[in-house]
């Protein structure tokens, strides 16, 4: 799905008009608050379907989420949805209205909830208060959603100031119906460590005051016990944490670490496990293949991507022809290395509007104190073919010659063809291919030159026609992997006093 404008957040003027379009390979539809607002469906010649949502005379009440989705997602690969959030700052609208059921928030367990007080202007400062208190509560606010956090059984209101007037929201009521069963989460500072480094794991249980932790881990099975430390997270009520700390890890400490939590009141229990890997030394490993020859098309942008695993975090450098590359201030080159998981990295070199000079030998080097890896490839810049010249001449020998010259990268192929019946060819009759037959009536001579500076091939082909008895349309077509180009010339017999 392609949405224009792409968002994901727009701030629009009150009373204005705004158009949203969404297109996809199947019929698409805009949705707002689980309904389909009036919109127009359209179609492009390439078979793409579009829907146009024209928002006119915008008010603050148009603030909110807009979704584009396939009209009938059955039978489609993915149930894809694109979300857009629109703000229409409107001083006449304080807080956006809520349905009655949104004002009552019921909980069956201690969990993060959202008090959905929303305003029309993302610049407004919004504060949350207990209904009977003036002190603003330290809860994070998202202008698109509201205040999110863990709330006690109380009544809450939101406040903001629009111009010089203070505006209060409706009251929101939070009710906790019962405390949930145990919910355990386990995480590690790192799941991969080198021998000699520390392993630190944390097991957190929420919503219970008295619990028992039990850890199982590889070292325990060999009789070497580690004493965990249990503490209460004072800033978060009813959060109890057990910390298992193993200093100076050994290879044998690799394996599964399990935290089992029980509480005796309701006889509830839960356990979670995590895998830890201890490595002898750090590593850098390439993932997937990158061909030694890569291609880019002239004046198009090209991103070259390398995926690798590493621990500890590596330094990544890119080189071209053994010279270090950096982000160019002109925006022609962009380098980025992203940490996509704890030990997995994606490094990207983006060439913007590729130039011929950017062809060459590229190397990515990722390294740290323990290991390094290099990946190199040759970048070839492909240039669409152009026919630069197609000319005809009459040497004294009596034969007639047609010369075709063109350039491109990779090396262009040349195809000669001719039409003898100018009225019917090429529309009704196919052109005749020349030069590849054993006939004596035409001879072909082709030379190819590689121009180092321009990094492209030049093809010069001369077609000798032994006997031309009537006007002949001769066509020279050059083709390569990224395009083709054609020119034609009319060759007339010597005997005719004019040329068409």
């Amino acid at each position: 799905l392609v949405v224009t404008p792409p968002g994901p957040e727009l701030v629009l003027n009150v009373s204005s008009t705004f158009v949203l379009t969404c297109s996809g390979s199947a019929p698409v539809v805009w949705e707002r608050m689980s309904q389909e607002p009036p919109q127009e469906m359209a179609k492009a010649q390439d078979g793409t379907f579009s829907s146009v949502l024209t928002l006119t005379n915008l008010t603050g009440l148009d603030t909110g989420e807009y979704f584009c989705t396939h009209n009938d997602s059955r039978g489609l690969e993915t149930d894809e949805r694109k979300r857009l959030y629109i703000f229409v700052p409107d001083p006449t609208v304080g807080f956006l209205p809520n349905d009655a059921e949104e004002l009552f928030i019921f909980l069956t367990e201690i969990t993060e909830i959202t008090i959905p007080c929303r305003v029309t202007d993302p610049q407004l400062v919004v504060t949350l208060h207990e209904k009977k208190g003036d002190v603003a509560l330290p809860v994070p606010y998202d202008h698109q959603r509201g205040f999110s956090g863990i709330f006690e059984d109380r009544s809450y209101i939101c406040k903001t100031t629009i111009g010089d007037r203070e505006v209060d929201s409706d009251a929101y009521y939070v009710y906790r119906l019962q405390v949930s069963s145990i919910n355990v989460s386990v995480n590690a500072v790192q799941t991969v460590v080198r021998q000699g480094e520390n392993i630190t794991l944390m097991c957190i249980v929420i919503g219970n005051e008295v619990v028992n932790f039990e850890w199982t881990y590889p070292r325990k099975e060999s009789g070497r016990l580690v004493e965990p430390v249990t503490d209460f997270l004072l800033d978060m009520p009813y959060h109890i944490r057990s910390i298992l700390h193993i200093p100076s890890a050994e290879l044998e400490d690799s394996g599964t670490y399990t935290c089992n939590v029980t509480e005796s009141v309701n006889d509830h229990q839960d356990e979670k496990a995590i895998n830890i890997t201890v490595v002898e030394s750090g590593y850098v490993r390439l993932l997937g293949e990158v061909g030694t020859l890569q291609f880019a098309e002239l004046h198009r942008s090209r991103t070259l991507q390398v995926v690798f695993e590493a621990y500890p975090p590596p330094t990544v450098l890119w080189f071209k022809d053994n010279r270090t590359l950096g982000d160019s201030s002109a925006g022609e080159i962009a380098l980025s290395t992203r940490n996509v998981s704890e030990t997995r990295y994606v490094s990207e070199l983006t060439l913007v509007r590729v130039k011929v000079a950017e062809a060459g030998h590229y190397t990515m080097r990722a390294f740290h104190e323990d290991a390094e890896v290099q990946l190199s490839f040759q970048l070839q810049i492909n240039v669409p073919v152009r026919v630069l010249e197609l000319s005809e001449s009459h040497p004294d020998s009596g034969e007639q010659t047609v010369r075709c010259r063109g350039r491109g990268m990779p090396q262009p192929n040349i195809i000669w063809s001719a039409c003898r019946d100018l009225k019917r060819c090429p529309r009704e009759l196919p052109p005749t291919l020349l030069g590849n037959s054993s006939e004596e009536e035409s001879q072909l001579e082709t030379n190819v030159t590689y121009w180092e500076e321009e990094q492209e091939f030049e093809v010069v082909s001369t077609l000798r026609l032994q006997h031309v008895d009537r006007p002949l349309s001769v066509r020279c077509t050059l083709r390569n992997a990224v395009g083709q180009d054609t020119q034609e010339v009319i060759v007339v017999p010597h005997s005719l006093p004019f040329k068409v």
């Epitope: 404008p5 701030v11 204005s16 297109s23 492009a44």
Partner: nanobody
């Protein structure tokens, strides 16, 4: 914001053709969305055809194959070629252009299809 001026509206017989123009006061190269809308008497304004930046022309079913939208960046003008006109095409035609979060309407031009 660009100012838009439509022209080309007229009275035309069924089956006839018209070409509407929408001239912009500034450059249209970076326009994200440009389209033609129409409003028949007593009805809502509705889109007829549009182009988004980098996209192909799109048409609603009722005009597909008869109407063609095009643009001339050098003249800062958008066009609507209307062929095989029908009485139900009678309406005031408006052009609309949008860049970023700013949109502009033209003042409208009347197209009447009648024998």
């Amino acid at each position: 914001e660009v100012q838009l001026v439509e022209s080309g509206g007229a009275l035309v017989q069924p089956g006839g053709s018209l070409r509407l123009s929408c001239a912009a006061s500034g450059s249209i190269v970076s326009i994200d969305f440009m389209g033609w809308y129409r409003q028949a008497p007593g009805k809502q304004r509705e889109v007829v055809t549009f182009i988004t930046s980098g996209g192909s022309p799109n048409y609603v079913d009722s005009v597909e194959g008869r109407f063609t939208i095009s643009r001339d960046n050098a003249k800062n003008t958008m066009y609507l070629q209307m062929n095989s006109l029908k009485p139900e095409d009678t309406a005031v035609y408006y052009c609309y252009m949008q860049s970023g979060t700013a949109g502009s309407w033209g003042q409208g031009t009347q197209v009447t299809v009648s024998s």
